[in-house]
């Protein structure tokens, strides 16, 4: 009898531990990636930022993958995605090619199965960075809640990448899973 | 036999209740702190904002502590941190000394064990607030996902604090725990 | 004896499944609503945006209701609310009535039981959109953590709605439940 009871208990324990693991104890995926300033592209047009840190300073990743400049989803779910992008210019860096700038960020999702890329979030501003001021700065923040499937890739594009602030507290993006897909 | 079964059941209940408590039912820490406008410091350089409400209007706190102008972490975990900072000037507000303003926010983490302070997030903009307009406004929003340890402190620094909008919907910061550290 | 044990197990299973359901397995409410550009109001003063998509493209909703331009809470809890609002003007759209603009967003909560409306979050900027540039753009992002009760309604107001960017990646708002109210 006692052995039977223990077997029943093991079944109960096992099932609910399994469920609890699936529910919350399974490490929820997340990433916080910070700009790798050693490899920022040049130009003023929209370019994809491919160099990000994932394991130094504030940068970290768990149950997601960073590869070829893209954040790859390993687990289906609803995720909150965010990006913070800072641009700056000091007169000691030399003259700007133009005082009228379009400082933008685009957070995009790429599906490998059906090769396609779509912008999930965008933000930014047109700015007039006049020579009357020796220093200019501008930051963009975007965030939103999206359904992501395993294998999908998140990337970040910006205009005027040469103006990016290279600090880890300034230019970063990330994601964290909030809940499963029903 | 019946007594034995009840004891086994109690063990099962106890263990999984304990786990469930650790998992999700344990109240996840959060805070949403709104600016206390009765005590905004002056200055043009970066100053720490130490007066925040934690228990009136939209302001609230749970399983975190607010002390000496800092939000103290009581529970290890990964948290989403955010701040919204609004600056404004009306011609009746006072004699603005410069049109060229650097309106910035810095969200910092201080570790008491290893006395050090580091900026987690920054945002803002340089602005030209001309006298040709009677009213000026600008808001900054930053957010990000960070690993925080018990005892660490989160604080907010801004430039030009006398330009802060004192409304609870305008100037606030907060945090909520998303998941445990593995 | 065996029947008794099964009954006990059913009790254990039942209670903890019920608790797990309440805890996390119950689908946590969320919404991500994108602007419906076919019905954007005109004017430069603060207006409520009532036309949003909830089931096309990135727009989605679960365990919340969208009705009469408002996002209705169906489940008490603490929610993270966010909004991203983009404004733009191209010279081909015609001349602006004024070059001095106040581009603002207000995320409000309305309680039906006690008829009242309160702003939870605001953001934006005054802008000088000069005729010297053919294109102007500006985005606002706000986010915060709030206690919401079943039946309460979330809505979004903006100034200068005719300048809104109608793209789904540009102008949206949303919410997701993070935790229960203790």
């Amino acid at each position: 009898g006692s052995q039977h009871i223990r077997a029943e208990k093991a079944m109960v324990d096992g099932s609910w531990l399994d469920l609890a693991k699936r529910s919350k104890l399974e490490a929820q995926p997340f990433a916080h990636l910070t700009i790798n300033a050693t490899d920022i592209p040049t130009g003023s047009h929209k370019v994809s930022l491919s160099s990000w840190y994932h394991d130094r300073g504030w940068a970290k990743i768990s149950n997601m993958t960073f590869s070829n400049g893209k954040l790859i989803v390993n687990q289906d779910g609803f995720y909150y995605l965010y990006a913070n992008i800072c641009f700056r210019h000091h007169e000691t860096s030399g003259d700007l090619a133009t005082e009228y700038l379009q400082l933008m960020v685009y957070v995009t999702k790429t599906s490998i199965k059906i090769p396609s890329s779509h912008t999930l979030m965008k933000g930014g501003s047109t700015k007039y960075w006049s020579g009357n001021s020796e220093f200019h700065f501008y930051s963009i923040n975007v965030g939103g809640f999206f359904k992501l499937r395993s294998g999908e890739e998140i990337s970040v594009e910006v205009s005027n990448p040469s103006l990016l602030d290279p600090d880890q507290d300034a230019t970063y993006f990330g994601a964290f899973k909030v809940r499963d897909i029903d | 036999g019946s007594q034995h079964i009840r004891a086994e059941k109690a063990m099962v209940d106890g263990s999984w209740l304990d786990l469930a408590k650790r998992s999700k039912l344990e109240a996840q820490p959060f805070a949403h702190l709104t600016i206390n406008a009765t005590d905004i410091p002056t200055g043009s350089h970066k100053v720490s904002l130490s007066s925040w409400y934690h228990d009136r209007g939209w302001a609230k706190i749970s399983n975190m502590t607010f002390s000496n102008g800092k939000l103290i972490v009581n529970q290890d975990g990964f948290y989403y941190l955010y701040a919204n900072i609004c600056f404004r000037h009306h011609e009746t507000s006072g004699d603005l000394a410069t049109e060229y303003l650097q309106l910035m926010v810095y969200v910092t983490k201080t570790s008491i064990k290893i006395p050090s302070s580091h900026t987690l997030m920054k945002g803002g903009s340089t602005k030209y607030w001309s006298g040709n307009s009677e009213f000026h406004f600008y808001s900054i929003n930053v957010g990000g996902f960070f690993k925080l340890r018990s005892g660490e402190e989160i604080s907010v620094e801004v430039s030009n604090p006398s330009l802060l909008d004192p409304d609870q919907d305008a100037t606030y910061f907060g945090a909520f725990k998303v998941r445990d550290i593995d | 004896g065996s029947q008794h044990i099964r009954a006990e197990k059913a009790m254990v299973d039942g209670s903890w499944l019920d608790l797990a359901k309440r805890s996390k397995l119950e689908a946590q409410p969320f919404a991500h609503l994108t602007i419906n550009a076919t019905d954007i109001p005109t004017g430069s003063h603060k207006v409520s945006l009532s036309s949003w998509y909830h089931d096309r493209g990135w727009a989605k909703i679960s365990n919340m209701t969208f009705s009469n331009g408002k996002l209705i809470v169906n489940q008490d809890g603490f929610y993270y609310l966010y909004a991203n609002i983009c404004f733009r003007h191209h010279e081909t759209s015609g001349d602006l009535a004024t070059e001095y603009l106040q581009l603002m967003v207000y995320v409000t909560k309305t309680s039906i039981k006690i008829p009242s409306s309160h702003t939870l979050m605001k953001g934006g900027s005054t802008k000088y959109w000069s005729g010297n540039s053919e294109f102007h753009f500006y985005s606002i992002n706000v986010g915060g953590f709030f206690k919401l009760r079943s039946g309460e309604e979330i809505s979004v107001e903006v100034s200068n709605p005719s300048l809104l960017d109608p793209d789904q990646d540009a102008t949206y708002f949303g919410a997701f439940k993070v935790r229960d109210i203790d």
Epitope: - | S44, T98, N132 | -
Partner: antibody
């Protein structure tokens, strides 16, 4: 060396006009708000006008509002005070003063010129 | 307008003495007070701002304190070169107003 040099003072009849100038050197003039402060013979200091760093904001006390106009030319590193409808009580040494960096709404003065004397008398 | 009342209007002290001047504002100005030194025939010089902060290059014998409406300026050990008139100024709200001055002389 940081320097402010006033000029343009002199004797003027009541109801007359005068334009004071202040030449700045040794610092980035365009970055600073500036003011004029006066001192009547044997009396204390009185602030009479201020101008923001970019020149789009101008400020006056009620005693001179509508009569005095402050302006600046950042390209020439120069500050001006146009004084109209002068009265006997406007007789004073007029100092050009640089507002120190600090809170954007607070004005105190870290660099002063030697002053120029304005006498209003018939 | 905020009125600034300075006292005394004049004082006489010996070299090495501790000298204290007070300034009273007609309303709360927090800590927005500056102190200036003006020697005869010269322009004023900034000594203290924000009630207690010494300006660059100002000797440590000069100090300031106070908040709200009552402020104190102190010369811890009077030196011959300190002979001057001292003015307080509120920098809290426009119009920026000065005290009437305190003339410091050597006995």
């Amino acid at each position: 060396e940081v320097q402010l040099v006033e000029s343009g003072g002199g004797l003027v009849k009541p109801g007359g006009s005068l334009r004071l100038s202040c030449a700045a050197s040794g610092f980035t003039f365009r970055n600073y708000a500036m003011s004029w402060v006066r001192q009547a013979p044997g009396k204390g200091l009185e602030w009479v006008s201020g101008i923001s760093s970019g020149g789009t904001y101008t400020y006056y006390p009620d005693t001179v509002k509508g009569r005095f106009t402050i302006s600046r030319d950042n390209a020439k590193n120069s500050l001006y005070l146009q004084m109209n409808s002068l009265r006997a009580e406007d007789t004073a040494v007029y100092y050009c003063a640089r507002r120190d960096y600090g809170d954007v709404y607070e004005w105190y003065f870290d660099v002063w010129g030697k002053g120029t004397t304005v006498t209003v008398s018939s | 307008d905020i009125q600034m009342t300075q006292s005394p209007s004049s004082l006489s002290a010996s070299v090495g003495d501790r000298v204290t001047i007070t300034c009273k504002a007609s309303q709360d100005v927090r800590t927005s007070i500056a102190w200036y030194q003006q020697k005869p025939g010269k322009a004023p010089k900034l000594l203290i701002y924000s009630a207690s902060y010494r300006y660059t290059g100002v000797p440590s014998r000069f100090s300031g304190s106070g908040s709200g409406t009552d402020f104190t300026f102190t010369i811890s050990s009077l030196q011959p070169e300190d002979i001057a008139t001292y003015y307080c100024q509120q920098h809290y709200s426009s119009p920026w107003t000065f005290g009437g001055g305190t003339k410091v002389e050597i006995k």
